[in-house]
Interface confidence: low
């Protein structure tokens, strides 16, 4: 429904809060680099031009696009050229050129600082001092940093950020309550972010088919009682609303999400019974709820999916008269029996299927030809099956740092060109599915694990199409979306790859390496793992586990001396030179 | 390198006493706040006590006041924990932090109060 004034309409549905907020996020996300307060001018000046534009939706420029207000606002930045280089050139577009111009430059490995966590009084202090500028804060740093973030999810975020405050500032540990609460909402909130950035990514790269059957398939899982109509209906809309945060319409999307929740909620008789607690919390927790609710009870009485996709003589004619509509039967009815899949296995079996049905449909005898189609399934499920049954084992042996690590060998040894930075990064977060995942019955082994690595390999892939430097991984990254996985699986050692020259100062350490916390200490060890492969790539896993033992004790000796940067200094030429020659470096 | 080390854990009946230690090294003990916090089996860490770097500001959770004692000795770099009138629910890994922090950097010593 049209309105005279789209940026009236949207305060009015979100109101002033929400509004303000996405504001905030919308422009963290396209200008990743302006300064806070720079960004908080912008959000004003727009906010008091969305009041008048209430007041008269008629009143001067109150008809113009959100694409266009946001734009026109963005390019008022006076060092756009000196901040963003070439992205200023957007500016001299009309839209809707400029917008995809702005999205283009988002940057998912932005050139800030750390967030360094500031002692707890003094984050108190600030919470009590500003607390609309503390919560604003972390908006920006959050949005600029993700510049993907799901939008109103990162509201529901802010709401528990400023919960955590209001209650731990007055308690009388503060750190024992606030501490756990942030670290909590930090690592959910990367894990929210990777998420959503492979959503956008599934969109932008794959289109909006793929997207669509992605949600086909996980909202059949969900809701097995639901009709097919009625999960089309959801998938539509939730579709239109990824869309719309993927693309930067935030307003839309936070208000599209809404009306969505509401909706399922309003019909949750005929969608899942397993939503009437979330359901009756306010907006924000609502549609985090439904977002995360469990998988609903498969209905008792299923018939074989064989009748009507094998059996039946009129598989060639239902399949031509309404492609997608049958191919969308199919996944929703293969994904309703099997909540124990992968969601990427559930669409690999849909495109054997369709590849089937294609070749078939198309033959002197379509029913002797696709008569078999089921048992092409079975490799297909076994392959992910055993994968995870063997990387479990190995978890359950090793336990997660170890794990990684023969994971960061074993992703080194496939695609050594990669940043040493980005294959620390993704081998920490895979080697994370063995204590997310493992522990589960098999019943949730694969839906965890092999979703899981499908957003872990998504970040890889948009790390690396920002400065491409392997073949492989673009290959890998593009030509499947859910292929990917057994894509790098398959991946062996490169052949082509010519070791890196030996550099002494990588593996120079110094005294601060003692003072840092053990995740960032592991990170340390594990850069350096990273680089000894890249040094030596033919090493075995013996050399590479005797140098890195090696490493931790020399590490722990001069953690523990008197003068402990002359330890390292010394001990660490002795080490450099034994694991030289251990390597034959 | 920053090392905590608690002792005078053990078995002990319900109703009875125990005093924990926590020696420290690595660091300038009598600089820093310290806790005792404790981990039941199955169970996630909860905070039980702080004491501020002077010794003069204690804090106690409220599953433990006027049962549990906290004091340290910075000549000896030393924290201390007095458990008096235990209970079985008091069973769980002490172990002690700097500041106050939920976060296990040492072993612990197991208190198991039973009969």
């Known amino acids: 429904d049209a309105h005279k004034s789209e940026v009236a309409h949207r305060f009015k549905d979100l109101g002033e809060e929400n509004f303000k907020a996405l504001v905030l996020i919308a422009f963290a996300q396209y200008l990743q680099q302006c300064p806070f307060e720079d960004h908080v001018k912008l959000v004003n000046e727009v906010t008091e031009f969305a009041k008048t534009c209430v007041a008269d939706e008629s009143a001067e420029n109150c008809d113009k696009s959100l694409h266009t207000l946001f734009g026109d606002k963005l390019c008022t930045v006076a060092t756009l050229r000196e901040t963003y280089g070439e992205m200023a050139d957007c500016c001299a577009k009309q839209e809707p050129e400029r917008n995809e111009c702005f999205l283009q430059h988002k940057d998912d490995n932005p050139n800030l600082p750390r967030l360094v966590r500031p002692e707890v009084d003094v984050m108190c202090t600030a919470f009590h001092d500003n607390e609309e500028t503390f919560l604003k804060k972390y908006l920006y740093e959050i949005a600029r940093r993700h510049p993907y973030f799901y939008a109103p999810e990162l509201l529901f975020f802010a709401k528990r950020y400023k919960a955590a405050f209001t209650e731990c500032c007055q308690a009388a540990d503060k750190a024992a309550c606030l501490l756990p609460k942030l670290d909590e909402l930090r690592d959910e909130g990367k894990a929210s972010s990777a998420k959503q950035r492979l959503k956008c990514a599934s969109l932008q790269k794959f289109g909006e088919r793929a997207f669509k059957a992605w949600a086909v398939a996980r909202l059949s899982q969900r809701f097995p009682k639901a009709e097919f109509a009625e999960v089309s209906k959801l998938v539509t809309d939730l579709t239109k609303v990824h869309t719309e945060c993927c693309h930067g319409d935030l307003l839309e999307c936070a208000d599209d999400r809404a009306d969505l929740a509401k909706y399922i909620c309003e019909n949750q008789d005929s969608i899942s019974s397993k939503l009437k607690e979330c359901c009756e919390k306010p907006l924000l927790e609502k549609s985090h709820c439904i977002a995360e609710v469990e998988n609903d009870e498969m209905p008792a009485d299923l018939p074989s999916l064989a009748a009507d996709f094998v059996e039946s003589k009129d598989v060639c004619k239902n399949y031509a008269e309404a492609k997608d509509v049958f191919l969308g039967m199919f996944l929703y009815e293969y994904a309703r029996r099997h909540p124990d899949y992968s969601v990427v296995l559930l669409l690999r079996l849909a495109k054997t299927y369709e590849t089937t049905l294609e070749k078939c449909c198309a033959a002197a005898d379509p029913h002797e030809c696709y008569a078999k189609v089921f048992d092409e399934f079975k490799p297909l499920v076994e392959e992910p099956q055993n994968l995870i049954k063997q990387n479990c084992e190995l978890f359950e042996q090793l336990g997660e740092y170890k794990f990684q690590n023969a994971l960061l060998v074993r992703y080194t040894k496939k695609v050594p060109q990669v940043s040493t930075p980005t294959l620390v990064e993704v081998s920490r977060n895979l080697g994370k599915v063995g204590s997310k995942c493992c522990k589960h019955p098999e019943a949730k082994r694969m839906p965890c694990a092999e979703d899981y690595l499908s957003v872990v390999l998504n970040q890889l892939c948009v790390l690396h199409e920002k400065t491409p430097v392997s073949d492989r991984v673009t290959k890998c990254c593009t030509e499947s979306l859910v292929n990917r996985r057994p894509c790098f699986s398959a991946l062996e050692v490169d052949e082509t790859y010519v070791p890196k020259e030996f550099n002494a100062e990588t593996f120079t350490f110094h005294a601060d390496i003692c003072t840092l916390s053990e995740k960032e200490r592991q990170i340390k060890k594990q850069t350096a793992l990273v680089e000894l492969v890249k040094h030596k790539p033919k090493a075995t896993k013996e050399q590479l586990k005797a140098v890195m033992d090696d490493f931790a004790a020399f590490v722990e000796k001069c953690c523990k001396a008197d003068d402990k940067e002359t330890c390292f200094a010394e001990e660490g030429k002795k080490l450099v030179a034994a694991s030289q020659a251990a390597l034959g470096l | 390198q920053v090392q905590l080390q608690e002792s005078g854990g053990g078995l002990v009946q319900p109703g009875g006493s125990l005093t924990l230690s926590c020696a420290a090294s690595?660091?300038?003990?009598?600089?820093?706040?310290m806790s005792w916090v404790r981990q039941a089996p199955g169970k996630g860490p909860e905070w039980v006590s702080a004491i501020d770097s002077s010794g003069a500001d204690t804090r106690y959770a409220d599953s433990v006041k006027g049962r549990f004692t906290i004091s340290r000795d910075n000549a000896k770099k030393t924290l201390y924990l007095q458990m008096n009138s235990l209970k079985p629910e008091d069973t769980a890994v002490y172990y002690c932090t700097i500041g106050r922090s939920t976060s296990r950097g040492s072993q612990g010593t197991q208190v198991t109060v039973s009969s």
């Open positions: 690595g660091f300038t003990f009598g600089s820093f706040g």
